[in-house]
């Protein structure tokens, strides 16, 4: 589709005569008829196959034709066509005299013709005007012409329809040849595919508008290059979606089981050495002078009553010192300079000579002890606390502080390791002498039934097109990570099928 444009510039008819030679009365009121047709080697009468147009009266005898394209479009004359421009044409321009106001062919006498010119040739589509001048015996016509494409038509012969658009079916302008030129940020045959944010992962990201990066399931981050770990993963990471690879010191399905309580919590006080002994379990080895599960209790070395024979104990920074009563000496006042003659036995104790009177021994009544029966019986000396419990004197009574896993007055009762339901996923717990044992239901294993061993959802290779399969352990389902160019829950659909399907 295009327009053949003819611009009449000047007509000269100095004598004001018709083609017959007869003069016009009073002058030649001149108008033009134009016939555009297919190429003819010899231009002959017949249908104006490309179109026809007439002008009003433009002047009398000789005149210049005003460019009137802005005021109604009479000059240049427009001859539109709705076909592919063939590149060749024939043109007939007739100048007529109008005696009255009726310019219809049937209203004019045949001898009203002033002049007739006919040309033919090649003409390419373009903006440039071709200037021509045709002279007859009595007249001269100067004109120019060109062929341009109609709006939205492009190419050498105006055959390519192209309309710029900026909606979801295309974002482009039209090039002179009618090809599309994508607007910035768009690509594809019809410029409807956005160019994603630079660096947006080809497989894991996509976009619906330029410079965007939207993540496919299982991926996150500005460029969709960070995997999303398994839901509930506490102290772990992933290298592919839905994984939970535990950080050092953590275990379990969700990496929420503390395997390094010592490092994470530093429970041992006063410089004690901490040893991990299982999940959330530890043992503190106390430095001298400290006691307690966490070595939190400062131990007075005099608490064990090391001084004998009534010696008094004094705590010192590096230990203790015994102040011995008269008649005794030694680190613990264990050596006596007394004999039974000195009545050394207190609290009704009876004295017995030894080594020919060089030494003695006291036989103490109940509730008293010591080499001189000077001490009330320490109820802890018999070590009544079982299973490593710590005995503490509390005035007239005593009590046992039990190690983890034991209870009772004398720590004689073994706390059931099963009491806190350590077996996961419905496992059955059995108490053993040195701990516990879990009997796991089908589909689970491990010391605490924490390892899922159910049928791998990926075992059946459900993903197509070389996609990577991941098992979602919490739901026994699979997730397919598609390679570039494929989508769908199983990556079964190629992106960008051609418009016509083969089926």
């Amino acid at each position: 589709s295009g327009v053949f444009q003819l611009q009449l510039q000047e007509f000269i008819n100095e004598r004001g005569v018709l083609a017959s030679g007869r003069p016009c009365e009073p002058g030649c009121r001149t108008f033009f008829r134009v016939c555009l047709k297919h190429f003819q080697a010899v231009v002959s009468p017949g249908p104006c196959t490309f179109g026809t147009v007439s002008t009003p009266v433009l002047g009398t005898n000789s005149f210049a034709v005003r460019d009137d394209s802005s005021g109604g479009g009479r000059n240049p004359l427009q001859l539109p066509f709705n076909f592919t421009w063939p590149g060749t044409f024939s043109l007939i321009i007739e100048a007529w005299h109008a005696p009255g106001d009726d310019l219809r062919p049937e209203a004019l006498p045949p001898d009203a013709l002033i002049s007739k010119i006919a040309i033919q040739g090649s003409l390419a589509v373009g903006q440039n005007w071709l200037l021509d001048e045709q002279t007859s015996t009595l007249t001269r016509l100067r004109y120019s012409y060109r062929v341009i494409c109609s709006d939205n038509y492009y190419g050498d012969n105006c055959s390519r329809l192209c309309k710029k658009r900026n909606d979801h079916f295309g974002h482009y302008v039209c090039q002179p040849d009618g090809n599309l030129s994508c607007l910035p940020g768009w690509t594809g045959e019809y410029c409807q595919q956005p160019i994603c944010l630079s660096g947006c992962h080809e497989q894991n990201g996509y976009c619906s508008k330029p410079a965007e990066c939207l993540c496919r399931p299982g991926w996150q981050g500005r460029l969709c290059n960070e995997c999303i770990p398994h839901n509930g993963c506490r102290h772990g990471t992933c290298s592919t979606p839905w994984q939970c690879t535990c950080d050092e010191g953590w275990g379990g399905l969700f990496c929420d089981q503390d395997l390094n309580y010592c490092t994470h919590h530093s429970p041992c006080k006063n410089g004690a050495t901490c040893s991990n002994s299982g999940q959330r379990s530890y043992t503190c080895t106390c430095r001298p002078g400290y006691t307690g599960v966490d070595c939190e209790l400062e131990l007075s070395e005099c608490d064990s009553n090391p001084c004998r024979n009534g010696g008094s104990c004094k705590d010192q920074e590096d230990g203790y010192h015994c102040l011995c009563p008269p008649g005794y000496y030694g680190l613990h006042c264990e050596h006596s300079t007394l004999s039974c003659a000195d009545s050394p036995c207190f609290n009704g104790g009876s004295c017995r000579e030894r080594n020919q009177g060089a030494n003695y021994a006291c036989e103490c009544p109940p509730n008293f002890t010591g080499s001189n029966c000077e001490k009330k019986v320490d109820r802890c000396t018999s070590n009544p606390c079982a299973n490593g419990g710590q005995c503490l004197n509390r005035g007239p009574s005593r009590m046992c502080r039990c190690r983890p896993g034991f209870t009772g007055t004398y720590c004689e009762l073994h706390v059931s390791d099963c009491a806190r339901n350590p077996c996961a996923h419905g496992g059955t717990c059995h108490d053993l002498e040195n701990g516990l044992m879990c009997t796991c239901p089908a589909g689970f294993s491990g010391r605490r039934c924490e390892v899922r061993t159910s049928i791998d959802a990926c075992a059946s290779s459900p993903c197509f097109n070389r996609a990577t399969c991941y098992t979602d352990l919490s739901t026994d389902t699979f997730v397919c990570n598609c390679p570039y160019g494929f989508v769908g829950s199983r990556c079964e659909f190629p992106v960008g099928l051609p418009p016509s399907f083969p089926w």
Epitope: D167, F169, S208, P494, L497
Partner: antibody, heavy 121, light 106 residues
């Protein structure tokens, strides 16, 4: 040959939400060459474009319905859906799903057979 | 909002030419489509991108679009062409249908 089939309830109460699904067979909804849309036609009246969606999830809605419309796509099921909330009797219409072809300048070359939805208490 | 205006009805004798117009502001700068809908049936695309015919559509259907008006022409109209015809265009990202023209073959 691609085919589209609408499904959903034929009767919806006023103020409730109209929900329809379009199942695509004979072709992939994930093709980059197509958009998938909804058009409705009240009894005895003309066609009204509701909106459309790309397989990536990008949506485009009629401004006059935008506040009430949601169109979604499920590529794994080869389906797309329409939800229209707070319906009134004026939403009674035959609802069509259709495929818009990018290579045809956005013209709809395939339509479902349509489903009549009546809004009435 | 963008509007497309069509005459409500057009009557034509069998074998004659029916012309249906569709007017909208600068419609010639947009691609116009035409759909045919017979009673109780879904619409069928008969013209896309102003003047192109989908496969299976008879040659008697033709289209043009310039200025503010798109035209669907049915030359040698047949009784089977009696139907409602809708023009359609895209205004930015919004689909717009004309009000429809009922073509009656006398």
């Amino acid at each position: 040959e691609v085919q589209l089939q609408e499904s959903g309830p034929g009767l919806v109460k006023p103020s409730e939400t109209l929900s329809l699904t379009c199942t695509v067979s004979g072709g992939s909804i994930s093709s980059s060459s197509y958009y998938w849309g909804w058009i409705r036609q009240p009894p005895g009246k003309g066609l009204e474009w509701i909106g459309d969606i790309y397989y990536t999830g990008s949506t485009y809605y009629n401004p006059s319905l935008k506040s009430r419309v949601t169109i979604s796509v499920d590529t794994s099921k080869n389906q797309f859906s329409l939800k229209l909330s707070s319906v009134t009797a004026a939403d009674t219409a035959v609802y069509y799903c259709a495929r818009y072809d990018v290579s045809l300048g956005g013209s709809s070359d395939h339509w479902g057979q349509g489903t009549l939805v009546t809004v009435s208490s | 909002s963008y509007e497309l205006t069509q005459p409500p009805s057009v009557s034509v004798s069998p074998g004659q030419t029916a012309s249906i117009t569709c007017s909208g502001q600068r419609l010639g700068d947009k691609y116009a489509s035409w759909y045919q809908q017979k009673p109780g049936q879904s619409p069928v695309l008969v013209i896309y991108e102003d003047s192109k015919r989908p496969s299976g559509i008879p040659e008697r259907f033709s289209g043009s679009n310039s200025g503010d008006t798109a035209t669907l022409t049915i030359s040698g109209t047949q009784p089977m062409d009696e139907a409602d015809y809708y023009c359609q265009a895209w205004d930015r990202d919004t689909g717009v249908f004309g009000y429809g023209t009922k073509v009656t073959v006398l």
